[in-house]
Interface confidence: medium
């Protein structure tokens, strides 16, 4: 599923991401935009043999199990395919674990490069939340 901007903002808010660990909703929507272009079925392969999955491009080396990433830790204890569902529950729950891990949203390269320090509130402007 490819979410609309406000549709995703509403879904993320419903799942408790607004101000989760101090990160406003705009940060999460911005991250999703630049990680996956709001596409729940996005997959991207990395040079270390891992793959990033879903709307928040969660990595199989650390967070999920795709059955083929060497040394996978699967810290979210889920199959990576669950992160590709049109229901973002699994991605959100895993993202909450990631953002609580010490580096906050710096874990997402796209957030660090494209969202951090910008007017992230613009990503939810005009949305009925």
């Amino acid at each position: 599923k490819v979410f609309g901007r406000c549709e995703l903002a509403a879904a993320m808010k419903r799942h408790g991401l607004d101000n989760y660990r101090g990160y406003s909703l705009g940060n999460w929507v911005c991250a999703a935009k630049f990680e996956s272009n709001f596409n729940t079925q996005a997959t991207n392969r990395n040079t270390d043999g891992s793959t990033d999955y879903g709307i928040l491009q969660i990595n199989s080396r650390w967070w999920c199990n795709d059955g083929r990433t060497p040394g996978s830790r699967n810290l979210c204890n889920i199959p990576c395919s669950a992160l590709l569902s049109s229901d973002i529950t699994a991605s959100v729950n895993c993202a909450k674990k990631i953002v609580s891990d010490g580096n906050g949203m710096n874990a997402w390269v796209a957030w660090r490069n494209r969202c951090k320090g910008t007017d992230v509130q613009a990503w939810i402007r005009g949305c009925r939340l």
């Epitope: 059955g67 060497p70 199959p79 395919s81 590709l84």
Partner: antibody, heavy 116, light 107 residues
Framework: QVQLQESGAEVMKPGASVKISCKAT????????IEWVKQRPGHGLEWIGE????????YYNEKFKGKATFTADTSSNTAYMQLSSLTSEDSAVYYC?????????WGQGTTLTVSS | DIELTQSPATLSVTPGDSVSLSCRAS??????LHWYQQKPHESPRLLIK???QRASGIPSRFSGSGSGTDFTLSINSVETEDFGMYFC?????????FGGGTKLEIK
């Protein structure tokens, strides 16, 4: 136990297309990548590409882009590979395998012969 | 693409001999190297994963070693059922690639 059952041998004419199937049993089909491998005598094994059935995500070896197309039907736990514009170079045994990085589980292979 | 070069192309041995098969990668692939055996008209069978881990049900006479670019599959005291083709495969990056194979034949 995990099993991959491929469709039977095919004899096709040059220029035609063929669709090979791979039915998976014994595991959660949507969770693992299905990979396709080509074997020709004297050419060893070649990785064609892969599909994640749960999402339909696909990756192709550059060499096979435009030649192979992967699809999957999660209702029947079956992956498909279509080969188009067949030539004699496509005559080979084609395997599906479960993508664990390594390949512990293989189909029995589908022999494709392209001949006029 | 990562190229895998296997040597020798053919190995003629007598049952009871011990042999070593080589697989060399064109660049470092850590331990992401797997070995297969294939008999005529059969699918490949996984022997060793991640350079040195024996797959389920594989006899202990098969062992693997190596890391980086140089890998070895060793068969201690070859048995008649071990004859066939042996392939290595890397899963360090895409596209996945295979070696050209080593044929183990009876002398």
């Amino acid at each position: 136990q995990v099993q991959l059952q491929e469709s039977g041998a095919e004899v096709m004419k040059p220029g035609a297309s063929v669709k090979i199937s791979c039915k998976a049993t014994g595991y959660t089909f949507t969770t693992y990548w299905i990979e396709w491998v080509k074997q020709r005598p004297g050419h060893g094994l070649e990785w064609i590409g892969e599909i994640l059935p749960g999402s339909g995500s696909t990756y192709y070896n550059e060499k096979f882009k435009g030649k192979a197309t992967f699809t999957a039907d999660t209702s029947s736990n079956t992956a498909y590979m279509q080969l188009s514009s067949l030539t004699s170079e496509d005559s080979a045994v084609y395997y599906c395998a479960r993508g664990d990085g390594w390949y512990c589980y293989w189909g029995q292979g589908t022999t494709l012969t392209v001949s006029s | 693409d990562i190229e895998l070069t296997q040597s020798p192309a053919t190995l003629s041995v007598t049952p009871g001999d011990s042999v070593s098969l080589s697989c060399r990668a064109s660049q470092s692939i850590s331990n992401n190297l797997h070995w297969y055996q294939q008999k005529p008209h059969e699918s490949p069978r996984l022997l060793i994963k991640y350079a040195s881990q024996r797959a389920s049900g594989i006899p202990s006479r098969f062992s693997g070693s190596g890391s980086g670019t140089d890998f070895t599959l060793s068969i201690n005291s070859v048995e008649t059922e071990d004859f066939g083709m042996y392939f290595c495969q890397q899963s360090n990056s895409w596209p996945r690639t295979f070696g050209g194979g080593t044929k183990l034949e009876i002398k």
